[in-house]
Every structure is written in structure tokens, then in C-alpha cells.
Interface confidence: low
């Protein structure tokens, strides 16, 4: 015998209190699959979280983070504070990268500058807190008449204005 609840589509639940009639999910709840006996409560995006996608009767709300924070964890379960380029987030807030390290993003940790000498190359452009060093050609590559090397302009995220 077929379970009458299997006929209840997404966005409804099988209401045992009403002879297993398919009832619409109440406000602020959803069912993403058919045959559900309950609807799930919608996620609320509040405080540091903001709504990326509203909850509907068939799908949960999706959150992202308010400006100044970025998502961490599956489904943006956490928001972590942004730092400026040239900084990393520690337990005591945003701290400048130590000498010899850099961070070109608003999240993540400071990483050591590239050691050009390991590849037998020279430093063409010194590193900063925000940028890695640019390695130049190895001395052997610098034969007479070789074309000069122009360092690349620092990359910038589209639409990103420095903080």
C-alpha cells in the first residue's frame, strides 16, 4: 500500500493531525523534498549575517556576511572579520605582517616572501607587507643586449579600493 504522504510535494508537509492531508509549510519554514512529515525552520540571517537568498517554501534562506566580514565554514556558518592587505587576523585583532612576510588579501595569513636565490635568481622588486618580491632573471640570463625587464604593476581586485 502506498504511503499517502509520498504524494506531498516539496513546500508542503504531511499533516498527521488532518488525515495526512498535504498542508503548506507555515511561514518561515520550508520542505525541500516531497513526502516530508514536518517543515524545517528557515535560517535567519541577522547581526553580522545578511540575507543572500530569501527563504521560500521549498528552500532554506542563504546568508553571507556584512561588509567588513567574510564567510567561513559550510554554508557560511561563520563570519570572520576582514583585515587590510598587509595584515593578518590574530586573536587580538588585525596585526601587520612581520618583516619578510606579506598578505595581498583581506583574509588569510601572512606568507613569507619568495626566496629568489633558491631558484638562482635575483630580487627585481623588493617585497612589502602587501606584495611578494618579484624575482628577476638569473645572472646567467643577463647576456649583453638582452631586453630589459619591466616589473609588473601590482595586481588589484576588480572594484577594490584600498582601505
Amino acid at each position: 500500500l502506498q504511503d499517502p504522504c509520498s504524494n506531498c510535494p516539496a513546500g508542503t508537509f504531511c499533516d498527521n493531525n488532518r488525515n495526512q492531508i498535504c498542508s503548506p509549510c507555515p511561514p518561515n519554514s520550508f520542505s525541500s523534498a516531497g513526502g516530508q512529515r514536518t517543515c524545517d525552520i528557515c535560517r535567519q540571517c541577522k547581526g553580522v549575517f545578511r540575507t543572500r537568498k530569501e527563504c521560500s517554501s521549498t528552500s532554506n534562506a542563504e546568508c553571507d556576511c556584512t561588509p567588513g566580514f567574510h564567510c567561513l565554514g559550510a554554508g557560511c556558518s561563520m563570519c570572520e572579520q576582514d583585515c587590510k592587505q598587509g595584515q593578518e587576523l590574530t586573536k587580538k585583532g588585525c596585526k601587520d605582517c612581520c618583516f619578510g612576510t606579506f598578505n595581498d588579501q583581506k583574509r588569510g595569513i601572512c606568507r613569507p616572501w619568495t626566496n629568489c636565490s633558491l631558484d638562482g635568481k635575483s630580487v627585481l622588486v623588493n617585497g612589502t607587507k602587501e606584495r611578494d618580491v618579484v624575482c628577476g632573471p638569473s645572472p646567467a640570463d643577463l647576456s649583453p643586449g638582452a631586453s630589459s625587464v619591466t616589473p609588473p604593476a601590482p595586481a588589484r581586485e576588480p572594484g577594490h579600493s584600498p582601505q
Epitope: 547581526g47 553580522v48 567561513l72 556558518s77 561563520m78 563570519c79 570572520e80 572579520q81 587576523l89 586573536k91
Partner: nanobody, 124 residues
């Protein structure tokens, strides 16, 4: 259900003081670091201050250091933010937040539950 309810906001003149409170329920308050954040009109949310579960460690954003003091009363399940020498740029909605994971160590930025906020307006 975890709940955080802020209060104590209002209108205050520049140079004035306010004390914000955050009443917590639904979890073991003393096991969690707590934080205050704020959102000025038209701006992103800014982290303001944090305190470890025991109250032994406190942290402040540079913008409020020396003017704001965070504290907690674990017997009352309440978090406080004492704000002195208030400036126009302190005008914002202030939120309290609970750390996601109970820790005995220092503050982390994994805040999972935020209150509804209380509005502070600094104006003459």
C-alpha cells in the same frame, strides 16, 4: 534556544557616557567568549570589543581603546559595554555576539549568534 537581548542604547551628547547590557540565555554563558560589534548607518559591521569566558582577557578595536570597557557578570548571564567620551562617529547599532565554540582560551572570531541590536546616537 540561544538568545541575546541588548539594551541601554539611546541619545547622548558628545563626551557623554552610556552602558550597554546584553542579557544571554539558552547556553552556559561562562563557557563562551562574547563580543560587541557595531554597524554605523550605511556602513559594514565593525568589531568593537571581546572578552573571554572567564572575563580574564579583553580585547578592543583601536577606535575605542581607552574609551570603552567590556565586562561580564557570569552570575547574571550578562555582558556589558561601558562607553565613555562618546563621539559622533560612535553612532551605530550595537550588537552583542556569542562565540561559536566553548573555549577556555582567548577570543576567536567565530561568532555564531548575534542579538537584534540597540541603537546609540551621539549628537548635540
Amino acid at each position: 534556544e540561544v538568545q541575546l537581548l541588548e539594551s541601554g542604547g539611546g541619545l547622548v551628547q558628545p563626551g557623554g557616557s552610556l552602558r550597554l547590557s546584553c542579557a544571554a540565555s539558552g547556553f552556559t554563558f561562562s563557557s563562551y567568549a562574547m563580543s560587541w560589534g557595531r554597524q554605523a548607518p550605511g556602513k559594514g559591521l565593525e568589531w568593537v570589543s571581546a572578552i573571554s569566558g572567564s572575563g580574564g582577557s579583553t580585547y578592543y578595536a583601536d577606535s575605542v581603546k581607552g574609551r570603552f570597557t567590556i565586562s561580564r557578570d557570569n552570575s547574571k548571564n550578562t555582558l556589558y559595554l561601558h562607553m565613555n567620551s562618546l563621539r559622533a562617529e560612535d553612532t551605530a547599532v550595537y550588537y552583542c555576539a556569542k562565540e561559536k565554540v566553548a573555549t577556555t582560551g582567548d577570543y576567536y572570531y567565530d561568532m555564531d549568534v548575534w542579538g537584534q541590536g540597540t541603537t546609540v546616537t551621539v549628537s548635540s
